[in-house]
């Protein structure tokens, strides 16, 4: 089958890292600098992604794979494929149009990115506050007062941390 296919289309023999050069009688030519082909049989090589400015190169472009970028220190990636870099803030802050601002009372952010989120309302689960919340940390909920009978465990583990949302900038 491979042989038949290559008789029909000589380009199918060109491996990744090359392209089928119509200007040279369909010879397999290496991808030019700053370009790549990740699959065989390509008629052109794709231009490599450029990592510049607030982006830095996480993985160099090769003849068979694209470059990958991430953000310089003090910034974090947003969007598909790290399409945007956003400034980090400190824990206990969120990034607003006016820069990094402390979380309002009753909210927290335990990361350098994303938005401040409300403390967990322990009473909704019939529990009490075991450890108060801060700007950087959620409250820790403990058992309800009724559960604190002799022999009962005095601490229940906190619910698993939720995936923090983030506000795209």
């Amino acid at each position: 089958f491979e042989r038949t296919r290559s008789l029909q289309d000589p380009c199918s023999n060109c491996p990744a890292g090359t392209f089928c050069d119509n200007n040279r009688n369909q010879i397999c030519s290496p991808c030019p600098p700053n370009s790549f082909s990740s699959a065989g049989g390509q008629r052109t090589c794709d231009i490599c992604r450029q990592c510049k400015g607030v982006f830095r190169t996480r993985k160099e472009c090769s003849s068979t794979s694209n470059a990958e970028c991430d953000c310089t220190p003090g910034f974090h990636c947003l969007g598909a494929g790290c399409s945007m870099c956003e400034q980090d803030c400190k824990q206990g802050q969120e990034l607003t149009k006016k820069g990094c601002k402390d979380c309002c009372f009753g909210t927290f952010n335990d990361q350098k990115r994303g938005i401040c989120r409300p403390w967990t309302n322990c009473s909704l689960d019939g529990k009490s506050v075991l450890v108060n919340g801060t700007k950087e940390r959620d409250v820790v909920c403990g058992p309800s007062p009724a559960d604190l009978s002799p022999g009962a465990s005095s601490v229940t583990p906190p619910a698993p941390a939720r995936e923090p949302g983030h506000s795209p900038q």
Epitope: D46, A80, G99
Partner: antibody, heavy 116, light 107 residues
């Protein structure tokens, strides 16, 4: 608050040069490249080039090679774009824009009119 | 250079309509496609980055989709303030390039 404030409108004669400034505030100037984009009357957006504010490296669109210079003054957080040998078809609004991947903040634009 | 072809170049629509604008790249740009709105006499305003991520402060009626070479901007229910010109732009590699724009006006 992130702001890019550009210099005022200019009227120039053909063959002259123009230098447009773009003063940044509300963020660390050297963290983001500055791009320049122009728009002729009633036309679309045309990318002119960028300057790396940290290292002064430039990359100009082919159309403007040899006629444009982009510079920065990090002490005043200001970027400059100079266009030389002006022609009537350089009449346009010139914008600076911060490069966070997309161009997330733009200056208000500077109208440059080239007329004899 | 990567060429971006936007369509249509103009469209007429009414308030409440669903509007779709497409942008096609001359080679794969993965998801590095941004959408801007521009009103007369004003600078462009970033709406969508990374093909589908909504910029902070932009109403949720705007959405973007696509990857590779074909991209779409959708306004789910057109509002009076949405009559403007929309541009796609690739931030995959320089020279950065823009689509030619789509003017959305009142029917």
């Amino acid at each position: 608050q992130v702001q890019l404030v550009q210099s005022g409108a200019e009227v120039k004669k053909p063959g002259a040069s123009v230098k447009v400034s773009c003063k940044a505030s509300g963020y660390t100037f050297t963290s983001y490249d500055i791009n320049w984009v122009r728009q002729a009357p009633g036309q679309g957006l045309e990318w002119m080039g960028w300057i790396g504010t940290y290292n002064g490296v430039t990359n100009y669109a082919q159309t403007f090679q040899g006629r444009v210079s982009m510079t920065t003054d990090t002490s005043t957080s200001t970027a400059y774009m100079e266009l030389r040998s002006l022609r009537s078809d350089d009449t346009a609004v010139y914008y600076c824009a911060r490069d966070a991947g997309p161009l997330d903040y733009w200056g208000q634009g500077t109208l440059v009119t080239v007329s004899s | 250079e990567i060429v971006l072809t936007q369509s249509p170049s103009s469209l007429s629509a009414s308030v409440g309509d669903r509007v779709t604008i497409t942008c096609r790249a001359s080679q794969s740009i993965s998801s590095y496609l941004n959408w801007y709105q521009q009103k007369p006499g004003k600078a462009p305003n970033l709406l969508i980055y990374g093909a589908s991520s909504l910029q902070s402060g932009v109403p949720s009626r705007f959405s973007g989709s696509g990857s590779g070479t074909d991209f779409t901007l959708t306004i789910s229910s057109l509002q009076p303030e949405d009559f403007a010109t929309y541009y796609c732009q690739q931030s995959y590699t320089t020279p950065y390039t823009f689509g030619q724009g789509t003017k959305v006006d009142i029917k």
